[in-house]
Interface confidence: low
Amino acid sequence: NEHDDCQVTNPSTGHLFDLSSLSGRAGFTAAYSEKGLVYMSICGENENCPPGVGACFGQTRISVGKANKRLRYVDQVLQLVYKDGSPCPSKSGLSYKSVISFVCRPEAGPTNRPMLISLDKQTCTLFFSWHTPLACEQATECSVRNGSSIVDLSPLIHRTGGYEAYDESEDDASDTNPDFYINICQPLNPMHGVPCPAGAAVCKVPIDGPPIDIGRVAGPPILNPIANEIYLNFESSTPCLADKHFNYTSLIAFHCKRGVSMGTPKLLRTSECDFVFEWETPVVCPDEVRMDGCTLTDEQLLYSFNLSSLSTSTFKVTRDSRTYSVGVCTFAVGPEQGGCKDGGVCLLSGTKGASFGRLQSMKLDYRHQDEAVVLSYVNGDRCPPETDDGVPCVFPFIFNGKSYEECIIESRAKLWCSTTADYDRDHEWGFCRHSNSYRTSSIIFKCDEDEDIGRPQVFSEVRGCDVTFEWKTKVVCPP
């Protein structure tokens, strides 16, 4: 996952990223504070800097890193590291270093250039971020227009592994392993013990050999209005065993089937080099959701979910030391408690409270891929602080044996926080800045016939800014 030519491959998908179009001696400038500029070139030296230097301070021409073309792929981010800059004034033996992270942004923003996010005074490292379409894997459209409406297949994308399909024509009844793994609109995700080729979206698993690629995403869905079918074509670069002049291809035909099941692909027929799958699913049926008070009607499912039995009281949920009050179609806390005005979900804290979304903003939806009713609240209180490079502060954190619930100035010249729960152990920190986001919450209701009312559990918390609850209850079970 590291190349030396301003290119890098995503090892799990085989996608090649190429940033060479950003290279050039003229380079770019990144402003720091209101004070000055850093000159920077991508994958090469900058004409405003000393020879061999990829980035330098504009005012002094002090090098903040030597140029190189070694692009790395790290957790869906492309990274270019310029090391061995000028000696860092604050630390003997350390040299300036620059870390440039390229982050996917499908459409180029108004300022298509690097931004200096932070300067770590301890390590003499400058952190830059560049949001650019060049860091995106080629996103294939996963929808198709049908008259005035759009049919979106993206709820069927498998986010973790792949769908399993079987070849019913094979005689061996003792073999219960899937014969195919399938994903749509994007490659299969890595699966433990199933080494499908990187980038494959349709993968055949022979009994006697390694999995083979029989289809990669070839384009967006296609509508056949006469047959009222939607097709997805897949092409591979794997030569067909029966005829080496051809490569394997696959096709999935989607048909409307209303109901609460999303369906799965099934092998319909196969010739020597082609595989045709059928997928019956409500996703391709004309759809509409209607919200009426605390009731959601989904036209694909032909069913109404009524949550009003959950709105008669609020529910308190505790995760670690944090307690949330959760309301369904009702305020999370009464007016006498205060501190969480208008909130549908509230983080309780003494007499104060933080709203994780206003009741007035409530939306109900049905998420087909999860077979779940989702209630969401938005526009709550402002999110807690984060560091200058966008890493969430972790509260509380331990520093010098004491616990802190907020950014502190102690022993540094500016407000800072730890980015882990124990600074004394990890020494990971950053300077604090305001968040420009507002708190939101979601409640994912899942069917569980054994739970009458049930109760919410904290499913995830993101940056103290977004909380998701999972709530298992028979209230959302279809008949």
């Epitope: 504070s33 950014c407 100035i409 010249a413 500016k414 407000l415």
Partner: antibody
Framework: EVQLVESGGGVVQPGGSLRLSCAAS????????MHWVRQAPGKGLEWVAV????????YYADSVKGRFTISRDNSKNTLYLQMNSLRAEDTAVYYC????????????WGQGTTVTVSS | AIRMTQSPSSLSASVGDRVTITCRAS??????LAWYQQKPDKAPKSLIY???SLEDGVPSRFSGSGSGTDFTLTISSLQAEDFATYYC?????????FGQGTKVEIK
């Protein structure tokens, strides 16, 4: 134009109290830490106190600890210094200053307000 | 608290002279030092931050250098408007502290 304007200075007796204000304009006040710095007549500069951008953290010079309180109202773009138990040695011109968020130091200063502690 | 010692306390110079003021910290403050200029009955004005970086709008005849404990402010060619008092200040650790000042007077 970035501007800081102090007010509230005056003559006060030893042991008395005074509240200084600093009105900010021309920048996003709520994003910056703010400082008070003072200068006794004919003397050098002395840092007095700092408050974080959101008011959650405050630090004081030893000479004023327990007597002075720094605060802010971000909705009014105003910084305050409440001075209690004033002493003759608190006589000075008091400046408010903006903290340079990125590199530290104080990059914008007010014109100052004079506090005289005298019986 | 970190002590900041400036030298000289005062100096006399003529227009066009090269002037150097030094500042010493009682302990390592890396490069977290600022220089300010103050004229009589006026507020201080920030000249240099991070030991060597010039504030916007400050003439290039001013420069700063140093790291650790020893720092220098240099005015390469003194102008009439530069006669003032100059202060160094550390912001490595609270409480922030200033040097006692250097008064630059006309010879």
């Amino acid at each position: 134009e970035v501007q800081l304007v102090e007010s509230g200075g005056g003559v006060v007796q030893p042991g008395g109290s005074l509240r200084l204000s600093c009105a900010a304009s021309g920048f996003t006040f709520s994003s910056y830490a703010m400082h008070w710095v003072r200068q006794a007549p004919g003397k050098g500069l002395e840092w007095v106190a700092v408050i974080s951008y959101d008011g959650s953290n405050k630090y004081y010079a030893d000479s004023v600890k327990g007597r002075f309180t720094i605060s802010r109202d971000n909705s009014k773009n105003t910084l305050y210094l409440q001075m209690n138990s004033l002493r003759a040695e608190d006589t000075a011109v008091y400046y408010c200053a903006r903290d340079d968020r990125f590199f530290g130091g104080m990059d914008v200063w007010g014109q100052g307000t004079t506090v005289t502690v005298s019986s | 608290a970190i002590r900041m010692t400036q030298s000289p306390s005062s100096l006399s110079a003529s227009v066009g002279d090269r002037v150097t003021i030094t500042c010493r910290a009682s302990q390592d403050i890396s490069s977290w030092l600022a220089w300010y200029q103050q004229k009589p009955d006026k507020a201080p004005k920030s000249l240099i931050y991070a030991a060597s970086s010039l504030e916007d709008g400050v003439p290039s005849r001013f420069s700063g250098s140093g790291s650790g404990t020893d720092f220098t402010l240099t005015i390469s060619s003194l102008q009439a408007e530069d006669f003032a008092t100059y202060y160094c200040q550390q912001y490595n650790t609270y409480p922030w502290t200033f040097g006692q000042g250097t008064k630059v007077e006309i010879k």
